[in-house]
Interface confidence: low
């Protein structure tokens, strides 16, 4: 079937348009194209003749139309007047007519739209906004565009005039933003340039900052106000409802109580003609004074005297802190703080309670430190100690005794030889001692704060002869496997060896034997029953040596898994039962008896006479060494035959 | 958002004892000052105790002093009222407060809904 | 120990009534003075610190005036939910409070 194609459809001015032919008979004999929907010769465009190849104007000729071989026209520079059908009339050679009707459409360029309104300054919540898309253009679509987003649904915007016109009602500050409009037609779309809608705004609430509306005497006030608006604000300032100052900002330096009240913040639109208020109440707090310590007792006695510490100045409502030695009180029975812990008792002071001390006054907005304040406690003397330690001295050494005692204020300090008055020195100095220089050497401390004295004496012995020494011990009844002993040599000799002995021997080379403090002292770790021997120690220098007695080591042990005997465990009937138990132990243990596990005798031995097998079972000895601690025990089975029953069976003792 | 919620309360004999406790949270529970306030059946409020941000100072009305005891676990958020020796006229609903960081700890500005506790036999 | 009487001890007026509470302080507390409203089964509620400050969120209906030993709370208009019990504190030590004021719906 014979049909026209229009390429394009729609058509845009001063474009062209191809009236395409499809399935075009043959053998034809020409064609003719008209304006219209059916052939009229009034309004033929052209005809064509085949044989002739001659093409022929018609009364709607424009001089614009060209026509193809195939029977297509071509349109070029097409107008708005060339909308419409368009009919093809074909004349086959056997002169069969045959028709077909095609169509286009005709549209404008658009032209760039530009947008028009009806108020360049509306008033937020109070006015409407109408923008117009222009100019009007017939067979248009008109669109819009908020944002380069599609307009949102919203009760506030409204599209009329063929959504030409977008109306906003109640226009509020979020409908601040980039307006578009676009026109459409089917060959062309084209969207205006952005208008920015300026809506008029506020002030709201202004806010003041910072929020903080409490401030102590001596800050800064510095208060910024801010409130929402187009234009901006226009600010100013009132104190308890006086004008101030018309800025945003408003600055108070080194405020007082005085400057406490109530603080408006007024935001003025002139566009608007609105004013917004904001009231913040502002509280200067008076500043604590800084705090200091007064003490009852500035020079107290230890062990004798309290102190009272004392944070002044008493505040109403205040919280009062201690700390000590920079750390907050500990929990002790001798400090006792008062209900309002204004006031710090120090019940029998130490020497340890010397401080410092720090009050502090607590507000929430800060803490107050005192400054530090040191306790000047007296004590002492404590027992002088006399160095060195050495009582032995040969002749024609320098004696030189030195003597401290611990005390506040220092200790003043005699020495005394045999009760007579010496000298008033912490040192004494002898040279060139004899035999005579032995005796009482006395060294006395004085406190003159507290009045108190304390003297230590120490025996001073010059001899060539170095004097027959003798073992201390730390430990004498020492445990095997958990204890240690230490031996010491005595006395302390200046220079002088210390030798020892075991049983006669010089010592073994063992690891749980130590010498130390000169050879002086002999440790031995972990002791056990072998090392209760005898010790000697010995003494020896340029001129003379000297040995001590021995000293036994007495080395608790045991008691050791106790043996029964005799061995049998087999008796006959009427035979005598005759158990006796043994158990290595120092000291002698404690033996008990049970049989089957009922107690019987606290004996070593355990005696039943002409036995039956009634006495079968099992005869348990227990052990306890009450030194030690130690208990230990064995179990033995005893079978008793009657007579004659069984060869090679015990006859008893 | 500032929050104090209460637990611990419930029925106790004469003589007993029971510890309140009191969760914090909303707000920095290390430096504010806390404290417990109480309202007896058919009686009006009555402040109980307080306590400082570092447990440093406590303080009692006379009616509970020396039965009472305030304490306070920065690390857990956490005030505790211990009540030992517990009377008949302990009976109330005692609520936990918050005394705020600024100016000074003159009033509570946050509570709790309250615990009841009951002291009868 | 300071000790703090409100007058009335209940009061019976309309919504849109003045309503004035007046709290007395036993010796000068200067302006630590506290007002809160307790209404039943909830937890007591803050109005006005330091005798004069609106707490934050405190409608300003609600203020308050005094200082010295006494005080006073002012609520301009009542409201339907202003209808509690009002007590007075002060911030000495102890942190004792008033008898408390009914407020009630004539």
């Known amino acids: 079937k014979l049909t026209i194609e229009s390429t394009p459809f729609n058509v845009a001015e001063g474009k062209e348009v191809l009236l395409l032919v499809h399935n075009l008979p043959q053998h034809l004999f020409g064609y003719s194209w008209y304006k219209g929907e059916r052939v009229d010769g009034n309004r033929q465009i052209i005809g064509y003749v085949i044989g002739t190849q001659q093409a022929t104007p018609g009364p709607a000729y424009s001089g614009r139309e060209i026509i193809y071989p195939n029977a297509s026209l071509l349109i070029q520079n097409i107008i708005q007047n060339d909308t419409g059908f368009y009919t093809l009339h074909v004349i086959k050679s056997d002169l069969v007519n045959e028709e077909a009707t095609g169509q286009f459409r005709v549209y404008p360029e658009l032209p760039k739209p530009s947008i028009s309104s009806n108020n360049s300054k509306p008033v937020e919540d109070k006015d409407a906004v109408a923008f117009t898309c222009e100019p009007e253009t017939q067979d248009a679509t008109y669109l819009w565009w908020v944002n380069n987003q599609s307009l949102p649904v919203s009760p506030r915007l409204q599209l009329s005039n063929g959504n030409r016109t977008l109306t906003l009602f109640n226009v509020t500050r979020n409908d601040t933003a980039s307006y578009k409009c676009e026109t459409q037609n089917p060959v062309s779309a084209r969207r205006s340039d952005s208008v920015i809608l300026n809506v008029l705004y506020g002030p709201d609430a202004p806010t003041i900052s910072p929020l903080n509306t409490s401030y102590r005497s001596g800050e800064n006030l510095n208060l910024s106000c801010h409130a929402a608006s187009n234009p901006p604000a226009q600010y100013s300032w009132f104190v308890n409802g006086t004008f101030q100052q018309s800025t945003q900002e408003l600055f108070i330096p080194n405020i007082t109580v005085n400057n406490s009240g109530s603080y408006t913040c007024q935001a003025h639109n002139s566009d608007t003609g609105l004013n917004r208020t904001t009231v913040t109440t502002i509280t200067v707090y008076a500043e604590p004074p800084k705090p200091f310590i007064t003490s009852n007792n500035s020079n107290p006695v230890e062990d004798e005297d309290a102190v009272a510490l004392t944070c002044e100045p008493e505040i109403q409502n205040t919280t009062y802190l201690w700390w000590v030695n920079n750390q907050s009180l500990p929990v002790s029975p001798r400090l006792q703080l008062s209900n309002d812990n204004r006031t710090l008792t120090l019940l029998s002071v130490t020497r340890n309670d010397v401080g410092p001390y720090e009050c502090g006054i607590q507000n929430e907005l800060s803490v107050d430190h005192s400054d530090p304040v040191i306790l000047n406690v007296l004590y002492g003397p404590d027992d002088p100690t006399i160095s060195p330690s050495y009582t032995y001295y040969r002749p024609g050494v320098n004696l030189s005794l030195s003597c401290h005692a611990a005390s506040n204020p220092p200790a003043q300090y005699s020495w005394l030889i045999d009760g007579n008055i010496q000298q008033h020195t912490q040192e004494l100095f002898i040279s060139n001692i004899t035999e005579k220089n032995s005796g009482l050497y006395t060294c006395q401390a004085n406190n003159s704060a507290s009045g108190h004295s304390r003297t230590t004496v120490k025996t001073i012995t010059v001899s060539a002869e170095l004097p027959k020494p003798s073992i201390s011990s730390n430990n004498s009844k020492p445990v095997e496997d958990k204890d240690a002993v230490a031996f010491t040599c005595e006395p302390e000799a200046q220079n002088t060896t210390y030798l020892w002995w075991v049983n006669g021997q010089s010592l073994p080379v063992s690891p749980r034997l130590q010498l130390s403090n000169g050879n002086r002292t002999l440790t031995l770790f972990n002791v056990t029953r072998n090392d209760a021997r005898a010790y000697v120690c010995g003494i020896q220098n340029s001129v003379s040596a000297n040995r001590s007695d021995p000293v036994t080591l007495d080395v608790l042990y045991g008691p050791d898994t106790p043996i029964i005997s005799p061995p049998d465990s087999s008796y006959l009937s009427g035979a005598n039962l005759n158990l006796s138990c043994h158990s290595a132990s120092n000291p002698s243990p404690q033996y008990s008896w049970r049989i089957n596990g009922i107690p019987q005798q606290h004996t070593q031995v355990l005696f039943i006479a002409k036995i039956t097998p009634n006495n079968n079972g099992t005869y348990a000895c227990f052990v306890s060494n009450l030194a030690t601690g130690r208990n230990n025990s064995i179990v033995k089975s005893i079978t008793v035959s009657a007579s004659g029953t069984s060869p090679g069976l015990s006859a008893g003792a | 958002e500032v929050q104090l919620l209460e637990s611990g309360g419930g029925l106790v004999q004469p003589g007993g004892s029971l510890r309140l406790s009191c969760a914090a949270s909303?707000?920095?529970?290390?430096?504010?000052?806390m404290g417990w306030v109480r309202r007896a059946p058919g009686k009006g409020l009555e402040w109980v105790s307080s306590i400082g941000s570092g447990s440093y100072s406590t303080s009692y009305a006379d009616s509970v002093k020396g039965r009472f005891t305030i304490s306070r676990d920065n690390s857990k958020n956490t005030l505790y009222l211990q009540m030992n020796s517990l009377r008949a006229e302990d009976t109330a609903v005692y609520y936990c407060?918050?005394?705020?960081?600024?100016?000074?700890?003159?009033?509570?500005?946050?509570w709790g809904q309250g615990t009841l506790v009951t002291v009868s036999s | 120990d300071i000790q703090m009487t409100q007058s009335p001890s209940s009061l019976s007026a309309s919504v849109g009534d003045r309503v004035t509470i007046t709290c007395r302080a036993s010796?000068?507390?200067?302006?630590?003075l506290n007002w809160y409203q307790e209404k039943p089964g909830k937890a007591p509620k803050l109005l006005i610190y330091a005798a004069s400050s609106l707490q934050s969120g405190v409608p300003s209906r609600f203020s308050g005036s005094g200082s010295g030993t006494d005080f006073t709370l002012t609520i301009s208009s009542l409201q339907p939910e202003d209808f509690a019990t009002y007590y007075c504190?002060?911030?000495?030590?102890?942190?004792?409070f008033g008898q408390g004021t009914k407020l009630e719906i004539k």
């Open positions: 010796q000068s507390i200067s302006s630590y």
């Open positions: 909303g707000f920095t529970f290390s430096s504010s000052y």
């Open positions: 407060a918050r005394y705020p960081s600024v100016p000074f700890p003159l009033h509570l500005d946050y």
């Open positions: 504190q002060q911030a000495g030590n102890p942190h004792t």
